[in-house]
């Protein structure tokens, strides 16, 4: 039975040209995290594998940095970066957990972080 929950940074906003950290955290399970995939809508951004380490998709290498931890840092943000991001936790023996983050990239200097929320 899958007992874990994914806590994410929820709905967040950031300034154009700035950077943002996307973070997910898996809790309430003793399952071993074997891999975390980060996706932006229909694009694979990066993978963090427990044995192989990080793989950043070449087309995002200039603007995506691994970490902190299992998180992902997006740099030099543009308005086109607005949208849904998913952290997909592959675990053993539980299976797959998915967290969702919505990022809005703003032209103005007013960019406040949203509250955290949980996805069971």
């Amino acid at each position: 039975m899958m007992t874990g929950t994914i806590e994410t940074t929820g709905n967040i906003s950031a300034e154009k040209g700035g950077s943002i950290i996307l973070q997910c955290h898996l809790s309430s399970t003793t399952a071993q995290v074997t891999q975390v995939n980060w996706e932006q809508q229909d694009q694979l951004l990066a993978i963090c594998n427990a044995d192989l380490g990080w793989h950043i998709s070449p087309s995002f290498k200039d603007r995506v940095a691994p970490g902190p931890g299992l998180g992902l840092t997006l740099q030099s943000l543009t308005v086109n970066d607005t949208g849904e991001y998913f952290c997909i936790y592959h675990t053993y023996p539980d299976g797959t957990y998915t967290g969702r983050i919505f990022l809005e990239v703003l032209e103005s200097s007013v960019a406040e972080h949203g509250a955290r929320f949980q996805i069971p």
């Epitope: 074997t34 891999q35 996706e39 229909d42 993978i47 044995d51 192989l52 998709s57 087309s59 023996p93």
Partner: antibody, heavy 118, light 107 residues
């Protein structure tokens, strides 16, 4: 240099058994998921089975489920495919392939031919 | 199971031509789509992974695009060594599945 070398193919009668091996070298075998892919003569590629690097979880194509068993021995850097109840339609070249991140297959062996015929 | 449909099944082209092969998935597979090249009697060779990432050592005339259900492999200027069969493959879920292949022949 990454190398994958399959062996164990040959001629077998319908209903018979065969065990294929894939000897890996040039990389940390235990860190990678591995797959078996086959190709019938003149046909396309068909994934047969896969085994995860971490959990050892095994996955099979419907066409071989219950007849084939994938396994690995990380101490010997070797991948196996035990094939039972073989049928004529299992005739193919069998390739082992390395699967980093469970997303792609970047290195393939040269293949070993399995012929099931009476 | 996810079905992968490749088109065309074969094509004739000349050296220097721009060649496009398409692959369609029966459901969304995000960008979990790979392209392989196979020559007669040889093992498949990875060209493009995760829809658009060029595998190390593969010439830059090969490129991949697409996401969701529709994907494309493009060879910008066909070279003599590119005459082969090309396969797409999804890794979104098991069972992993391949397209039927596209044979690129000399015109």
């Amino acid at each position: 240099e990454v190398q994958l070398l399959e062996s164990g193919g040959g001629l077998v009668q319908p209903g018979g058994s065969l065990r294929l091996s894939c000897a890996a070298s040039g990389f940390t075998f235990s860190s990678y998921s591995m797959n078996w892919v086959r190709q019938a003569p003149g046909k396309g590629l068909e994934w047969v089975a896969g085994i995860k690097y971490s959990s050892g979880n095994k996955y099979y194509a419907d066409s071989v489920k219950g007849r084939f068993t994938i396994s690995r021995d990380n101490s010997k850097n070797t991948l196996y495919l035990q094939m039972n109840s073989l049928r004529a339609e299992d005739t193919a070249v069998y390739y082992c392939a390395r699967g980093p991140y469970d997303v792609w297959m970047d290195y393939w062996g040269q293949g070993t031919l399995v012929t099931v015929s009476s | 199971d996810i079905q992968m449909t490749q088109s065309p099944s074969s094509l004739s082209a000349s050296v220097g031509d721009r060649v496009t092969i398409t692959c369609r998935a029966s459901q969304s597979i995000s960008s979990y789509l790979n392209w392989y090249q196979q020559k007669p009697g040889k093992a498949p060779k990875l060209l493009i992974y995760a829809a658009s990432s060029l595998q190390s050592g593969v010439p830059s005339r090969f490129s991949g695009s697409g996401s969701g259900t529709d994907f494309t492999l493009t060879i910008s200027s066909l070279q003599p060594e590119d005459f082969a069969t090309y396969y797409c493959q999804q890794s979104y879920s098991t069972p992993l599945t391949f397209g039927g292949g596209t044979k690129v022949e000399i015109k």
